[in-house]
């Protein structure tokens, strides 16, 4: 296993609907041609798998159909998006990637981005 | 070095606007958060809210909502602060901060503060 | 909003003397995002400590935090002549973000 740097922005406010994006690049050493992303998300010491997807080079990234994340890659990029979040959501959303074909195996995982969420504010009951 | 630059004093009349920016350097500007603090005389530290230079999304204190804008130019990397009808008791020192996420989870890098006067 | 208050509100003390101060959150903030300031007068504030227990860049080893929970302490050893200043605590565990009033030290 070799490791690999991976960058991606430290902190990221999500939008009003519960949308967070942000951008996760790695140093490609090799022309590989099977990647795997994973997003995890540590939160009081806990890690999680928020999602996951293995993609061919040039292709859409697919993750399962229940998951909160979806991507498109171009180049050494992935540009990932998570839905659905709430404000106990909040939490450090860290990416790992791994080179998975040809040899060799490579490792990296980045510093996290920080991931703030605001719950939307009820909207007031109106009389028709 | 790293470091945010703000602009200078203000003395404005009461219900006018007035709009402090703060220009970073040093880092990759969208990376981080800018979040903007106020001390009028003699108090401590009130947070007003803070802008997600990587996005754009803004998320500002309750009791500000509504008369405060913060923006990003990012082809400057600068950050504004707009406050709107402003009262005697907006008086205050008014600082930008970098907010670090990751890295640190805290405002490592301070601007060194802009004085708004109201006054009439 | 979690609410940061801070004792004592000021804190008399003479050169060399070890000043303690507390600073606890009306509910639970993870350690890593507890952080302390210190500002003098005419000065912008400074960052002391981050993640409850690190400290920053520059920050002499007189200086150390320590807590969790909701109850959190930054102590300095020996107070030397440029300590003298106002400290405050601040949490970025939830928004909104939150500081604590501060606490003044101030020689005796």
């Known amino acids: 296993c070799k490791a690999m740097h991976v960058a991606q922005p430290a902190v990221v406010l999500a939008s009003s609907r519960g949308i967070a994006s942000f951008v996760c690049e790695y140093a490609s050493p090799g022309k590989a041609t099977e990647v795997r992303v994973t997003v995890l998300r540590q939160a009081d010491s806990q890690v999680t798998e928020v999602c996951a997807a293995t993609y061919m080079m040039g292709n859409e990234l697919t993750f399962l159909d229940d998951s909160i994340c979806t991507g498109t890659s171009s180049g050494n990029q992935v540009n990932l998006t998570i839905q659905g979040l709430r404000a106990m959501d909040t939490g450090l959303y860290i990416c790992k990637v791994e080179l998975m074909y040809p040899p060799p195996y490579y490792l990296g995982i980045g510093n996290g981005t920080q991931i703030y969420v605001i719950d939307p504010e009820p909207c007031p009951d109106s009389d028709f | 070095q790293v470091q945010l630059v703000q602009s200078g004093a203000e003395v404005k009349k009461p219900g006018a606007s007035v709009k402090v920016s703060c220009k970073a350097s040093g880092y990759t500007f969208t990376s981080y958060g800018i979040s903007w603090v106020r001390q009028a005389p003699g108090q401590g530290l009130e947070w007003m809210g803070w802008i997600s230079a990587y996005n754009g999304n803004t998320n500002y204190a309750q009791n500000l909502q509504g008369r405060v804008t913060m923006t990003t130019d990012t082809s400057t990397s600068t950050a504004y602060m707009e406050l709107r009808s402003l009262r005697s008791d907006d008086t205050a020192v008014f600082y930008c901060?970098?907010?670090?996420?990751?890295?640190?989870?805290?405002?490592?890098?301070w601007g060194q503060g802009t004085m708004v006067t109201v006054s009439s | 909003e979690i609410v940061m208050t801070q004792s004592p509100a000021t804190l008399s003390l003479s050169p060399g003397e070890r000043a303690t101060l507390s600073c606890r959150a009306s509910q639970s903030v993870s350690s890593s995002y507890l952080s302390w300031y210190q500002q003098k007068p005419g000065q912008a504030p400074r960052l002391l400590i981050y993640g409850a227990s690190t400290r920053a860049t520059g920050i002499p080893a007189r200086f150390s935090g320590s807590g969790s929970g909701t109850d959190f302490t930054l102590t300095i050893s020996s107070l030397q002549p440029e300590d003298f200043a106002v400290y405050y605590c601040?949490?970025?565990?939830?928004?909104?973000?939150?500081f604590g009033p501060g606490t003044k030290v101030d020689i005796k």
């Open positions: 601040q949490q970025d565990y939830n928004l909104p973000f939150t």
């Open positions: 901060a970098r907010l670090t996420g990751a890295t640190s989870h805290a405002f490592d890098i």
